[in-house]
């Protein structure tokens, strides 16, 4: 902000100008502003070896305003702080520091993580997902007729994406094998999707349980509903190769 300086004018008494420029209330030829109009801040500006008084509408970056009955002045923020309301309340830290509750920190406290975009310490946010949507109709190659075994899918939405240190999201897609009443497609019905058929109860040794894809489990952080003993998985695969397998998407 450029501040106005006192013009050389008729003097009220030695060295003090009467008609000061801009925001100066009183000024001198040699020292510039000596005092400021209301709501303006007095600051000293160095010009060569000389310090000139200036009146500013707001303090420059790195300084904060303090009010006194006779003068409002600009004071430097702490060394690690770029902008502040006062020395105890920083609003933007210098590079390499993280802002937390008005303070500039080298590292974020326990339970918080550094956001390198905003340079703030923020709460760790864990993934949140919705309830599963209903299973889709049992289909095979997009058809709901003309087959015995098909697949059905269900999905759920991510309500809250996790932050860097947050728990990853569990699978949001699940697919399982299903059986339908064997039925020939009627004329014009071939290829139609979405007509739900009554499903037969699973045959012995045939399961409708959806097992999340083990790869997707390994890539996500353990969440109780996802946890499955690896030995149990192997055992299950050996026992029944027909076992349904889920195609899961991890975010």
């Amino acid at each position: 902000q450029n501040a106005s300086r006192g013009r050389r004018q008729r003097r009220m008494h030695p060295n003090v100008s009467q008609g000061c420029q801009g925001g100066c209330a009183t000024c001198s030829d040699y020292n510039g502003c000596l005092s400021c109009k209301p709501r303006l801040f007095f600051a000293l500006e160095r010009i060569g070896m000389k310090q000139i008084g200036v009146c500013l509408s707001s303090c420059p970056s790195g300084y904060y305003g303090t009010r006194y009955p006779d003068i409002n002045k600009c004071t430097k923020c702490k060394a690690d702080c770029d902008t502040c309301f006062n020395k105890n309340f920083c609003t933007k830290c210098k590079s390499g520091f993280y802002l937390h509750l008005g303070k500039c920190l080298d590292n974020c406290p326990e339970g918080l993580e550094a956001n390198n975009h905003t340079m703030e310490c923020v709460s760790i946010v864990h993934c949140e997902v919705s309830e599963w949507n209903p299973w889709s109709p049992c289909t095979k190659k997009g058809k709901t007729c003309g087959f015995k075994r098909g697949t059905e899918t269900r999905v759920r939405e991510i309500i809250q994406h996790p932050s860097a240190k947050g728990n990853l999201c569990p699978p949001t897609n699940e697919t399982r094998k299903c059986t339908v009443q064997r039925k020939k497609c009627q004329k014009g019905e071939r290829g139609k999707k979405g007509r739900e058929r009554k499903r037969k109860k699973p045959n012995k040794g045939e399961s409708k349980e959806a097992i999340p894809d083990s790869k997707s489990l390994e890539s996500s952080k353990e969440i109780p509903e996802q946890r499955e003993n690896k030995q149990q998985q192997k055992k299950r695969k050996v026992q029944d190769k027909q076992k349904s397998v889920s195609v899961s998407t991890v975010h």
Epitope: S58, Y64, T66, T75, L101, G102
Partner: antibody, heavy 117, light 111 residues
Framework: QVQLVQSGAEVKKPGASVKVSCKAS????????IHWVRQAPGQGLEWIGY????????GYNQKFKNRVTMTRDTSTSTAYMELSRLRSEDTAVYYC??????????WGQGTTLTVSS | DIQMTQSPSSLSASVGDRVTITCKAS??????????MNWYQQKPGKAPKLLIY???NLESGVPSRFSGSGSGTDFTLTISPVQAEDFATYYC?????????FGAGTKLELK
């Protein structure tokens, strides 16, 4: 003279969002930070956060951090405060105020928000 | 957070009385010799109005019957003599640290 004029009363359902405006006049909008303070019926004052109109930098009370967003439009000298995922406890009068050297010296007239199903 | 405890929560006075409201901060609100404490007056249905800044400085246009004192954690607002237009709620507020916090208020009522 300095004036802050706020938008009118709002009635919202729980889970909805509200955006309150605060139009400044009588001074250079970018000179002072604008803060938002609320007051629940019959209660005291609670600070929500601030925005620097000069560059748009903002900071919020931790209590509101995940639900509040403060923005500004320098062309119209207007500050905005948006509160999301509203609940009945957010029913209050919301004030904007200029912050001059560590005190709130000018206030808007207040915007009444009622959150009810 | 710095907690601001105001007392009393309400008091009754007559025109001409001297009243004192106190505010105690849970930790010092002073820094570099400055006290970051303000006092506001609020009337029903109106926005708060700044009375005292930096603990003891009278805001421009505020009558001299209002005065503030204190430092560190203990602060006082005094009104003497009380006038009819002074019946309102008074709040202290610290601006030393994030988050900025207010006292719960003191309601001054007509006896």
């Amino acid at each position: 003279q300095v004036q802050l004029v706020q938008s009118g009363a709002e009635v919202k359902k729980p889970g909805a969002s509200v955006k309150v405006s605060c139009k400044a006049s009588g001074y250079t909008f970018t000179d002072y930070s604008i803060h938002w303070v609320r007051q629940a019926p019959g209660q005291g004052l609670e600070w929500i956060g601030y925005i620097y109109p000069s560059n748009g930098d903002s900071g919020y009370n931790q209590k509101f951090k995940n639900r509040v967003t403060m923005t500004r439009d320098t062309s119209t000298s207007t500050a905005y405060m948006e509160l999301s995922r509203l609940r009945s406890e957010d029913t209050a009068v919301y004030y904007c105020a200029t912050y001059f050297a560590n005190n709130f010296d000018y206030w808007g007239q207040g915007t009444t928000l009622t959150v009810s199903s | 957070d710095i907690q601001m405890t105001q007392s009393p929560s309400s008091l009754s006075a007559s025109v001409g009385d001297r009243v004192t409201i106190t505010c105690k901060a849970s930790q010092s609100v002073d820094y570099d010799g400055d006290s970051y404490m303000n006092w506001y007056q609020q009337k029903p249905g109106k926005a708060p109005k700044l009375l005292i800044y930096a603990a003891s400085n009278l805001e421009s246009g505020v009558p001299s019957r209002f005065s503030g004192s204190g430092s560190g954690t203990d602060f006082t607002l005094t009104i003497s003599p009380v006038q009819a237009e002074d019946f309102a709620t008074y709040y202290c507020q610290q601006s030393n640290e994030d988050p900025l916090t207010f006292g719960a208020g003191t309601k001054l009522e007509l006896k």
